[in-house]
């Protein structure tokens, strides 16, 4: 999916008002310095591409993020503010959701959500030069 036509400011507002809090809740009990940020993004469409991938694509050691509250809210925000997103992405992620077992918070998942927090922070500051 090409995130170029999304309403970035509305997505940012949804992140600040609700998604960010759910990410913090998920990470509660984890030190902010525990994980290094290894995933980066260069602009807002690129950030959303990486956020989409890390949130909904199963990875080795962490296959359950799509059921988390922050993931459902991310999906809703993208469905609302990115025209055409639902048709191209939702059915695929729903199929994956059905295949998943119960929620398990592994260290790998915590690391992945830490990466997500970094991507969202970068999304919110699009004018900053890439480090």
């Amino acid at each position: 999916y090409d995130f170029t036509n999304c309403d970035f400011e509305k997505i940012k507002a949804a992140y600040l008002s609700t998604i960010s809090k759910d990410l913090i809740t998920y990470m509660s009990g984890t030190k902010s310095t525990e994980f290094n940020n290894t995933v980066s993004c260069s602009n807002r469409p690129h950030c959303l591409t990486e956020i989409q991938s890390l949130t909904f694509n199963p990875t080795a050691g962490c296959a359950s993020l799509a059921k988390e509250m922050f993931a459902m809210k991310t999906k809703a925000a993208l469905a609302i503010w990115c025209p055409g997103y639902s048709e191209t992405q939702i059915n695929a992620t729903q199929a994956m959701k059905k295949a998943r077992k119960s929620k398990v918070t592994t260290n790998k998942c915590l690391e992945q959500v830490s990466q997500l927090q970094g991507l969202w922070r970068r999304f919110n500051r699009p004018l900053l030069k890439q480090q």
């Epitope: 309403d7 509305k10 949804a14 008002s17 609700t18 998604i19 459902m72 809210k73 999906k75 809703a76 925000a77 469905a79 609302i80 503010w81 025209p83 055409g84 639902s86 048709e87 939702i90």
Partner: antibody, heavy 120, light 111 residues
Framework: QVQLVQSGAEVKKPGSSVKVSCKAS????????INWVRQAPGQGLEWLGV????????IYAEKFQGRVTITADTSTSTAYMELSSLRSEDTAVYYC?????????????WGQGTLVTVSS | QSALTQPPSASGSPGQSVTISCTGT?????????VSWYQQHPGKAPKLMIY???KRPSGVPDRFSGSKSGNTASLTVSGLQAEDEADYYC???????????FGGGTKLTVL
């Protein structure tokens, strides 16, 4: 069962406000969109706006911006639509309608409708 | 945002097919594959018959089909039955600030 149940008919004076409720049951309220659509006597359908409780997002039709307020109480699975500065042209049946999960613009479940009559 | 344009009436005999058109612009029907159709019997709430241009919700007979070409969407009812007599409304998404604009409605009469 899966349903939307709306509050009863209202008669209002011009210039006043009306608040219509829509109670959901049988499905996960927060995940869907709750849209409001009205139909004046003998006329077609007109979309007023939507709320997606999961993310607390409300979107209003440009025509009703500033005059309509849509809210939701997730603890009671109830959505509300308040229309202010009523005029006779606002006389209509007001429907709440469920927008499909992540496809909030397709209305797959409707309330029974609430007749709002604006008359002096 | 202007309403979509539908013919006010359409008719057909039992067993026949009838097609109802719905014309919009590149800002709505032409710009998105997010067209839906609703059936409304007198005094009742509307019912979703077609969504995403041509998909049918479960429980809707396959006699109902939808299509789109350019800025015009169409609903076809084949093998007309008496219970198909109703008003039909098309709807289209028209951007992130307009989830639905409706057509004026078409009264379908089964002769």
């Amino acid at each position: 069962q899966v349903q939307l149940v709306q509050s009863g008919a209202e008669v209002k004076k011009p210039g006043s406000s009306v608040k219509v409720s829509c109670k959901a049951s049988g499905f996960t309220f927060g995940s869907y969109g709750i849209n409001w659509v009205r139909q004046a006597p003998g006329q077609g359908l007109e979309w007023l706006g939507v709320i997606v409780p999961l993310v607390g997002v409300t979107i209003y039709a440009e025509k009703f911006q500033g005059r309509v307020t849509i809210t939701a109480d997730t603890s009671t699975s109830t959505a509300y639509m308040e229309l202010s500065s009523l005029r006779s042209e606002d006389t209509a049946v007001y429907y709440c309608a469920r927008g499909q999960e992540y496809f909030y613009w397709y209305f797959d479940l409707w309330g029974q409708g609430t007749l709002v009559t604006v008359s002096s | 945002q202007s309403a979509l344009t539908q013919p006010p009436s359409a008719s057909g005999s039992p067993g026949q097919s009838v097609t109802i058109s719905c014309t919009g612009t590149t800002s709505d029907i032409g710009g998105y594959n997010r067209v839906s159709w609703y059936q409304q019997h007198p005094g009742k709430a509307p019912k979703l018959m077609i969504y995403e241009v041509s998909k049918r919700p479960s429980g809707v007979p396959d006699r109902f089909s939808g299509s789109k070409s350019g800025n015009t969407a169409s609903l076809t009812v084949s093998g007309l039955q008496a219970e198909d007599e109703a008003d039909y409304y098309c709807s289209s998404y028209a951007g992130t600030d307009t989830f639905a604009i409706f057509g004026g409605g078409t009264k379908l009469t089964v002769l």
